[in-house]
């Protein structure tokens, strides 16, 4: 009798622990990655930003992986993804090649199983940064809710990377898991 | 035997209630604060906005505190923070002194233990608001995922506060807890 | 004795399942709706966008309903709402009626019990899209945390809908439930 009770309790405990593990102890994945200013590429066309901090300042990561400039999903789920990208120019930096600029961000998802890349979110603006002003600034913010599978990779592409603001509060992207896939 | 069973059940119930309390009954903190238009400061440089509604219209708060113009964290955790700031000018609003404006928001974290302030997020744009148009408008949105400790304070700084749109749907900031710190 | 134990276990299991159902098995509602480009209205004033995809590409919905151009809440709770709206014009699209544009988004909540509509969030910018540039682009992002009741409806209004970017990564809105109402 006593063994039977213990076995039943173990079942209850087991299922409780399973829930606990899934909902509480198995920490939900997240990442907040800030731009690595020492390694910003040049160019005016769309380029992928591959250098981000995940372990200093506001940069952090848990149950996701950062590798080869991409944020890799380790756990299936629905995630909220976001990016904040700031561009700036001061007249002391030198003359702009053109006053008409297309300042854009693209948040892309790459599946390694099926080698293909898709843009999840885009944002930005065309700007006229005239010589009449000594300083110019512009920020883009995008965010959205997406189904991500383990092994999929998130990356950031921008136009005019040489104009990026290198501060950690200015140029960053991130993700956090909101819920499981049914 | 019966007492032993009850004791074991109490243990199961105890741990279940603990989980329930943590994951469900101990409500996750959040806040959504809307601008108090009756008390917008003047100035052109970065100024702190200290007057926000937390208990009327869309304004609300739970398990966080609003005091002295700052949103105070009461529970350690990872939070998603966001801000939406709208600026506007109509020719009837007053004599605008310059067409060249820097419209910016800074979301800052202050630690009272170590008296220091750090910018978590910034956004905005330089704008040319010419007299050729009778109305001008611009909005900024920023958001990000941050580790916050109990006692830390979140505040909002903006440039050109007299240009703020005073509507509750226009100028607001908020936070909600996503998960515990491991 | 054995029946008594089973009854007690059933009570534990029942309450555990109740928690599990609420926190895990009863999936949290969400939606990510992308613009249906085949059905964008014309006009320059504020119009409601009623045609969105919820079941193709990045579009998805769960435990919410999309009907008559509105996202309907099925479950009381606190939700994070967001919208990303992109506007664009290329000189090949034809001449703009005016170079001075007000590019705006309004995220509105409608209660059918009390027939009234309220703007939860707004964003945008006045823009000068001159003929000196062959292409113009601008994106708006808004997001915020709101209490929504079952039966309430979320809709999107924009100015200048004919300038909307029809890509699924450009013009979308969504919501996900973060927590229950206490």
């Amino acid at each position: 009798g006593s063994q039977h009770i213990r076995a039943e309790k173990a079942m209850v405990d087991g299922s409780w622990l399973d829930l606990a593990k899934r909902s509480k102890l198995e920490a939900q994945p997240f990442a907040h990655l800030t731009i690595n200013a020492t390694d910003i590429p040049s160019g005016s066309h769309k380029v992928s930003l591959s250098s981000w901090y995940h372990d200093r300042g506001w940069g952090k990561i848990s149950n996701m992986t950062f590798s080869n400039g991409k944020l890799i999903v380790n756990q299936d789920g629905f995630y909220y993804l976001y990016a904040n990208i700031c561009f700036r120019h001061h007249e002391t930096s030198g003359d702009l090649a053109t006053e008409y600029l297309q300042l854009m961000v693209y948040v892309t998802k790459t599946s390694i199983k099926i080698p293909s890349s898709h843009t999840l979110m885009k944002g930005g603006s065309t700007k006229y940064w005239s010589g009449n002003s000594e300083f110019h600034f512009y920020s883009i913010n995008v965010g959205g809710f997406f189904k991500l599978r383990s092994g999929e990779e998130i990356s950031i592409e921008v136009s005019n990377p040489s104009l990026l603001d290198p501060d950690q509060d200015a140029t960053y992207f991130g993700a956090f898991k909101v819920r499981d896939i049914d | 035997g019966s007492q032993h069973i009850r004791a074991e059940k109490a243990m199961v119930d105890g741990s279940w209630l603990d989980l329930a309390k943590r994951s469900k009954l101990e409500a996750q903190p959040f806040a959504h604060l809307t601008i108090n238009a009756t008390d917008i400061p003047s100035g052109s440089h970065k100024v702190s906005l200290s007057s926000w509604y937390h208990d009327r219209g869309w304004g609300k708060i739970s398990n966080m505190t609003f005091s002295n113009g700052k949103l105070i964290v009461n529970q350690d955790g990872f939070y998603y923070l966001y801000a939406n700031i709208c600026f506007r000018h109509h020719e009837t609003s007053g004599d605008l002194a310059t067409e060249y404006l820097q419209l910016m928001v800074y979301v800052t974290k202050t630690s009272i233990k170590i008296p220091s302030s750090h910018t978590l997020m910034k956004g905005g744009s330089t704008k040319y608001w010419s007299g050729n148009s009778e109305f001008h408008f611009y909005s900024i949105n920023v958001g990000g995922f941050f580790k916050l400790r109990s006692g830390e304070e979140i505040s909002i700084e903006v440039s050109n506060p007299s240009l703020l749109d005073p509507d509750q749907d226009a100028t607001y900031f908020g936070a909600f807890k996503v998960r515990d710190i491991d | 004795g054995s029946q008594h134990i089973r009854a007690e276990k059933a009570m534990v299991d029942g309450s555990w399942l109740d928690l599990a159902k609420r926190s895990k098995l009863e999936a949290q509602p969400f939606a990510h709706l992308t613009i249906n480009a085949t059905d964008i209205p014309s006009g320059s004033h504020k119009v409601s966008l009623s045609s969105w995809y919820h079941d193709r590409g990045w579009g998805k919905i769960s435990n919410m309903t999309f009907s008559n151009g509105k996202l309907i809440v099925n479950q009381d709770g606190f939700y994070y709402l967001y919208a990303n709206i992109c506007f664009r014009h290329h000189e090949t699209s034809g001449d703009l009626a005016t170079e001075y544009l007000q590019l705006m988004v309004y995220v509105t909540k409608t209660s059918i019990k009390i027939p009234s509509s309220h703007t939860l969030m707004k964003g945008g910018s006045t823009k000068y899209w001159s003929g000196n540039s062959e292409f113009h682009f601008y994106s708006i992002n808004v997001g915020g945390f709101f209490k929504l009741r079952s039966g309430e409806e979320i809709s999107i209004e924009v100015s200048n809908p004919s300038l909307l970017d029809p890509d699924q990564d450009a013009t979308y809105f969504g919501a996900f439930k973060v927590r229950d109402i206490d």
Epitope: N132 | S44, S93, D95, L96, A97, T98, E99, G131, S162 | -
Partner: antibody, heavy 122, light 107 residues
Amino acid sequence: EVQLVESGGGLVKPGGSLRLSCAASGFTFRNYAMSWVRQAPGKGLEWVAGISSGGTYTYYPDTVKGRFTISRDNARNSLYLQMNSLRAEDTAVYYCARRDYGDVYEWYFDVWGTGTTVTVSS
Amino acid sequence: DIQMTQSPSSLSASVGDRVTITCKASQDVRTSIAWYQQKPGKAPKLLIYSASYRYTGVPSRFSGSGSGTDFTFTISSLQPEDIATYYCQQHYSSPWTFGGGTKVEIK
């Protein structure tokens, strides 16, 4: 040295016109809103016109609206006041004044010229 | 338009005296008040802005206070070089208006 120098004052008959100039030096003129402030003999100060840093906004009190026009040439670091339909009560010393940085809607003046005298008399 | 009423219109004080001038606005101007000094035959000079902020290079004996409609300008210890007419100006809303002035003389 930050300096404002007015010129163009003189004697003019009622109903006549006059154009005042102000030459700015020692600061980045294009970054500042500017104003004209006048002072009638033995009287106080009266603001008569203002212009935004880029020159697209102009402001006047009712006393001169429609008669006076303020303008600027940022390339030449110059401010102007075109005065038409002059009256005896427009007789004053006219000062060119730089608006200090501050709230975009608030105007006070941190740099003043030495003034130029306008006399309206028949 | 906002009217600015300054008092007294003139005053006489000794070197080292504390001198106080008041300015009353016809409506609430928050703290948007500036104070100027004008010596005979010269242009005005900005001393105080936003009611209490001393402009760059202005000696600490000059101070301002007040908010709403009532404002005070103080010279803590009058010096011979302070002989001048002092004006208040509201910078709250256009048109920008000045007080009538207070002439300060030495006894």
